[in-house]
């Protein structure tokens, strides 16, 4: 039985996307709560056992700032990588000729606040490759649509996105 609104011939309108406002975050709860990206599980360093949980992202459709020249910004958890790759496609579709740019990924330098998800490869700060800040509100919305677990229009200069830990996702899906 075809339910209401599911009949043949009905045109599907693409979802109208509204940009996030400066300082807005989605979902509207704190980043490290259960309804968003979940708790901080501990800093990952290059010589820690958990370093193997991080995977490099060599997607050619993503620009990495890599200010440290160490490749650290490319390292992230698999879930973060999956969401980022999905977002990269959305960005190119939204703005032809423009790519997704990552300014911060995994951080080993201690730049970020205590218990930042950057320290375990679960957070990225992103911009567009043209660094046109008038696009960042919509970039944040695209990040929400791409499936990031928490998206924050944190700064005039970037959008902060984070994901749940791999184990919490696996437990939920029964994997």
């Amino acid at each position: 039985i075809i339910g209401p609104g599911r009949g043949f011939g009905k045109r599907r309108h693409p979802k109208k996307l509204t940009p996030l406002a400066y300082k807005q975050f989605i979902p509207n709860v704190a980043e490290k709560t259960l309804g968003a990206s979940g708790r901080y599980e501990g800093k990952i360093t290059r010589n820690s056992e958990r370093f193997k949980e991080l995977t490099p992202n060599y997607n050619p459709d993503i620009i990495f700032k890599d200010e440290e020249n160490t490749g650290a910004d490319r390292l992230m958890t698999q879930r973060c990588k999956d969401k980022l790759n999905a977002l990269a496609i959305s960005v190119m579709n939204q703005w032809p000729g423009v790519k997704l740019r990552v300014t911060e990924g995994w951080d080993e330098d201690g730049h970020h606040s205590e218990e930042s998800l950057h320290y375990e490869g679960r957070a990225v700060d992103i911009t567009t490759s043209d660094r046109d800040r008038s696009k960042y509100g919509m970039l944040a919305r695209l990040a929400v649509e791409a499936g990031f677990d928490w998206v924050y229009y944190e700064s005039k200069a970037h959008i902060h996105c984070s994901v749940k830990a791999e184990n919490s996702v696996a437990a939920k899906s029964g994997g």
Epitope: E67, N69, T103, D109, K156, A157
Partner: antibody, heavy 123, light 105 residues
Framework: QVQLQESGPGLVKPSQTLSLTCTVS??????????WSWIRQHPGKGLEWIGS???????YYNPSLKSRVTISVDTSKNQFSLKLSSVTAADTAVYYC???????????????WGRGTLVTVSS | SYELTQPPSVSVSPGQTASITCSGE??????VSWYQQKPGQSPVLVIY???KRPSGIPERFSGSNSGNTATLTISGTQAMDEADYYC????????FGGGTKLTVL
Amino acid sequence: QVQLQESGPGLVKPSQTLSLTCTVSGGSINSGGFYWSWIRQHPGKGLEWIGSIYYSGNTYYNPSLKSRVTISVDTSKNQFSLKLSSVTAADTAVYYCARGQDSGDYDWYFDLWGRGTLVTVSS
Amino acid sequence: SYELTQPPSVSVSPGQTASITCSGEKLGYKYVSWYQQKPGQSPVLVIYHDNKRPSGIPERFSGSNSGNTATLTISGTQAMDEADYYCQAGDSSAVFGGGTKLTVL
């Protein structure tokens, strides 16, 4: 606390290369997040950013000076340096070294400054 | 290249509020800093990140930035605030405004 001190010749001949060094004391130049910078001020005029260097070696230069400027860092000596080639009288200025911090994506602000050193270009 | 425009001079009576403007295209999308420079001295950062005050800077200094204009406000201006003030914004290339001479009458 962190302090910056410029050093170098106060007089340079036209067409020569101006060379200045900034010594950082009270902290490591290797600290992430800082952009070690040079800024100059012509006599009685405003401030002009020359360029900045990150501890990793990445450099950023004022487009109007880029062809003549080289900024380098020596982490072992906790120093960074400025070289400005083919100088003319128009390069006569007080040269400041400064520590830049990043508000965002190259949104620098300069929170620490050296005392400045006057460099005169004259034959 | 990007340009920031400031009025060359601003005058204020002691105890009054001084406002110094800085304008540039889409300046509201950038972070603005302000520096105070007294004769013969190095510049001192008084405002960064549009409206943040470094430690040691009096509360009478405040900043705002939206649209194409940033403003440095000095409330209850004192004689010691007489100086040159420079706005600055960055975008892979730090740019300074031309400076404003604040005179406390």
